[in-house]
């Protein structure tokens, strides 16, 4: 399996989180890894132990401190390794020089709640969890709407290149079911990738007056 | 883009030793791991030694453990592999190679994962 594609990934959620994915192609592994985090310029480490996500691949959580410590700065650099057992002794996987601001992951929005709902138009606001201060204003987010009849897939994205925690969504159809999911990115890091989707919020616009026209 | 620029090869004795260095300029990256590969008339490219972004960690094929040593000097965004105890069937055509994401280890030898390649400096080993 040294020949197989390997890959090992971990990204920041920007305050005291680390989550790594471990994965061998055409591996069976039935042996314990762990990842072990060894910052260069901190007294503490800490370790995670992998476990199964998929046949081929394994996932963890470092846990750096309560959930909105700031544990890493920008001039942090993380030693990464998977270790797995063999036997007695335990083997070096992979080993990277992890910087925690050039791959950051944000956890998904939360909160999300319906300000005013009309029956063309939907004001909903969300909030951003566990986001570092230092991102400041440096943020983007992503927002889509499903339709009726329609999947997430379909759904056009709307985007948002700024810090803002709102979007007024228009030319909804009166008295109809959507739901909406937001994500959002820092503007920084190479390795920066989207958070996960919100979980949905949905919301009914509200019906066209008898006798209105619409 | 990214250029790398691989020097210092050419003929040693078998016993003798050779320093070889990559220089590479363009666009530069945050964690990459850089690595020396190989490859012999006739033979498929093979892993040599990686190492860290920070130089910390290295990576050594069992072929070459204890007479190769992989270096770098991110000052200088060089790569350099010191080449001990050299013997005939090291005679290859030397890659230097960047991966971007910067993973080294056993799993991790693949010429595959690497995006960045130089175009090789020729060492032969006489006996």
């Known amino acids: 399996a040294v020949n197989g594609t390997s890959q090992f990934t971990c990204f920041y959620n920007s305050r005291a989180n680390i989550s790594c994915v471990w994965s061998q192609d055409g591996a069976l592994q039935d042996t314990s890894c762990q990842v072990h985090a060894w910052p260069d310029r901190r007294r503490w480490n800490q370790t995670c132990e992998l476990l199964p996500v998929s046949q081929a691949s394994w996932a963890c959580n470092l846990i750096l401190g309560a959930p909105d410590s700031q544990k890493l700065t920008t001039v942090d650099i993380v030693t990464l390794r998977v270790l797995c057992r063999e036997g007695v002794r335990w083997r070096v996987m992979a080993i990277q020089d992890f910087k925690p601001f050039e791959n950051l992951r944000l956890m998904a929005p939360i909160s999300l709640q319906v300000v005013h709902v009309e029956t063309h138009r939907c004001n909903i606001s969300w909030e951003i969890s566990q986001a570092s201060h230092y991102f400041e204003r440096h943020l983007e987010f992503e927002a889509r709407t499903l339709s009726p009849g329609h999947t997430w897939e379909e759904a056009p994205l709307l985007t948002l290149k700024q810090k803002q925690e709102w979007i007024c969504l228009e030319t909804l159809t009166p008295d109809t079911q959507y739901e909406f999911q937001v994500r959002v990115k820092p503007l920084q890091g190479e390795f920066t990738t989207w958070s996960p989707w919100s979980q949905p919020l949905a919301f009914r616009t509200k019906p066209a007056a008898l006798g209105k026209d619409t | 883009q990214v250029q790398l620029v691989e020097s210092g090869g050419g003929l040693a004795q078998a016993g003798g030793s050779l320093r070889l260095s990559c220089a590479a300029s363009?666009?530069?990256?945050?964690?990459?791991?850089k690595a020396w590969f190989r490859q012999a008339p006739g033979k498929e490219r093979e892993f040599v030694a990686a190492i860290t972004w920070s130089g910390r960690d290295t990576d050594y094929a069992d072929s070459v453990k204890g007479r190769f040593t992989i270096a770098r000097d991110n000052a200088k965004n060089t790569v350099y592999l010191q080449m001990d105890s050299l013997k005939p069937e090291d005679t290859a055509v030397y890659y230097c190679a960047v991966y971007p994401q910067g993973t080294i280890g056993p799993y991790f030898r693949s010429s595959n994962h690497y995006d960045y390649w130089g175009q090789g400096t020729q060492v032969t080993v006489s006996s």
């Open positions: 363009g666009r530069t990256f945050s964690q990459d791991a």
